[in-house]
């Protein structure tokens, strides 16, 4: 009774095809699969950026898989052939491990990269990026991004620099079409002719670094004697109502009365008769049903109202503002 | 159910050109990598250069420079032009195919008999 044996997988590699991040694990089946031919082989892979503690692991009946690293580091992975149970008369067999391994032969030191990268995807529509030079570089450096998201055939280049003093110091993006709740790949090289420049690799996702616009149309409406409802709108643009928080500042007669955090375009504040003077203002940012993070917009302009009858002037604006 | 056919192989001189041709036909729903391996009796085959997902192309050791590796989809058929040809490039030149059958829901690998390219004076 002979013990079954599988050779690993052939061929196997990591092949970079310039999507600054996204790669392809690929491999071919082990030698000898004759005697299995009535078997469908399943190859257990795991991968990870040199650093990391964990492995992710993935398990296909495929010839390649493919996912996001992040190129600042090297990248290794792992692959063996499993025949299931089926096959082996009731245990699995695993293979030897064939291991490979990716980077990018970086150029450079470190201080030369970009400094500070910040972007920010404004109101969900116009995306813009922007950095420091890398320390002790001279004023021939240049620095040129580099985008890809799937659905692009190729990395495009930054059409639409921000310069100051004659370097690269920002991207403003064309529209994105299709291009949110997917990984966004950002490279951001340099030349200099006086020394090597190292890249930088970025990933995110658009739709949490979105910066929406202030909400507008503030107003107030007197509800009953000690109720007042503070009503704004969503700003003009895509973003739906249901992708909104919002945090909004209540000041009443020049002392803070309360900040509060609401999901709808309505907040109801209990008064007292006292009141001479309420202000309002309202900031948005998106919730978490449609990102994982996100950044609040500006304040809106303040919306005031003073004067002893504040409850006979709100009653007049609110029927103004229906009629 | 998967046949690929390879010819374009033969004698040539040293510093001359072949092009070699592998057409796939058969029941194969869609083509995902094509690449040429070569073989020398008693040693190991190498992968020679590829299109792999996104039409990426790679090419291994010597025949950086030297090869260009093509595709005619309509065709279903991938070209190895081979030039500046030298005695070490002298092999057995075998087609792959990693591609899903019609009747298949993963990835197969598909390899064609060989040419032999012999570079000789």
């Known amino acids: 009774d002979t013990e079954i044996k599988v050779n690993p997988p052939q061929d196997f590699e990591i092949v970079d095809p310039g999507y600054l991040g996204y790669l392809y694990l690929q491999w071919q089946p082990p030698l000898s699969l004759d005697h299995f031919k009535e078997c469908t082989v399943e190859y257990e892979l795991k991968y990870r950026n040199i650093g990391s503690e964990t492995w992710k692991t993935i398990i296909t009946k495929n010839l390649h898989y493919k996912d996001g690293f992040d190129l600042n580091k090297g990248i290794e992975a792992k692959i063996h052939t499993l025949l299931p149970w089926q096959c082996t008369n009731g245990s699995e067999v695993q293979s030897s491990w064939a291991e490979t391994t990716y980077w990018i032969s970086p150029q450079g030191i470190p201080e030369t990269k970009v400094q500070d990268m910040d972007c920010v995807y404004y109101n969900w529509q116009y995306l813009l990026c922007s950095w420091k030079p890398g320390i002790g570089v001279l004023l021939d450096t240049n620095y040129n991004l580099f985008y890809w998201y799937e659905g692009l055939d190729h990395a495009l280049q930054c059409v639409d620099y921000i310069k100051a003093d004659g370097q690269n110091i920002g991207c403003r993006f064309p529209y994105l079409e299709a291009s949110d709740y997917k990984d966004f790949y950002i490279c951001v090289n340099g030349s200099s002719e006086n020394k090597p420049i190292r890249s930088s690799y970025f990933t995110f996702q658009l739709q949490n670094i979105v910066k929406p616009l202030p909400p507008v149309y503030l107003t107030f409406t007197r509800e009953s004697s000690c109720e007042i409802k503070l009503k704004w709108s969503i700003p003009l643009g895509p973003i739906p109502a249901r992708c909104f928080d919002y945090e909004i500042e209540i000041r009443e007669d020049d002392t803070t009365l309360v900040t509060a955090t609401v999901e709808n375009e309505t907040y109801t504040l209990k008064t007292t008769n006292e009141t001479r003077q309420l202000c309002f203002v309202v900031r948005s940012k998106v919730n978490i049903y449609c990102s994982d993070d996100g950044i609040w917009s500006e304040w809106s302009d303040k919306q005031c109202w003073e004067g002893e009858d504040l409850s006979k002037k709100t009653l007049l604006r609110h029927h103004h503002h229906h009629h | 159910q998967v046949q690929l056919q390879e010819s374009g192989g033969g004698l040539v001189q040293p510093g001359g050109s072949l092009r070699l041709s592998c057409e796939v036909s058969?029941?194969?729903?869609?083509?995902?990598?094509m690449a040429w391996y070569r073989q020398v009796p008693g040693k190991e085959r190498e992968m020679v250069a590829q299109?792999?997902?996104?039409?990426?192309?790679k090419y291994y050791g010597s025949a950086k420079g030297r090869f260009t590796i093509s595709k005619d989809s309509a065709k279903n058929a991938v070209y190895l032009q081979m030039n500046s040809l030298k005695p070490e490039d002298t092999a057995v030149y075998r087609c792959?195919?990693?591609?899903?059958?019609?009747?298949?829901?993963?990835?197969?690998?598909?390899w064609g008999q060989g040419t032999q390219v012999t570079v000789s004076s």
């Open positions: 058969g029941s194969i729903s869609s083509i995902n990598r």
């Open positions: 792959n195919i990693v591609g899903v059958l019609t009747t298949g829901h993963y990835e197969n690998s598909f």
């Open positions: 299109i792999t997902y996104g039409d990426t192309i």
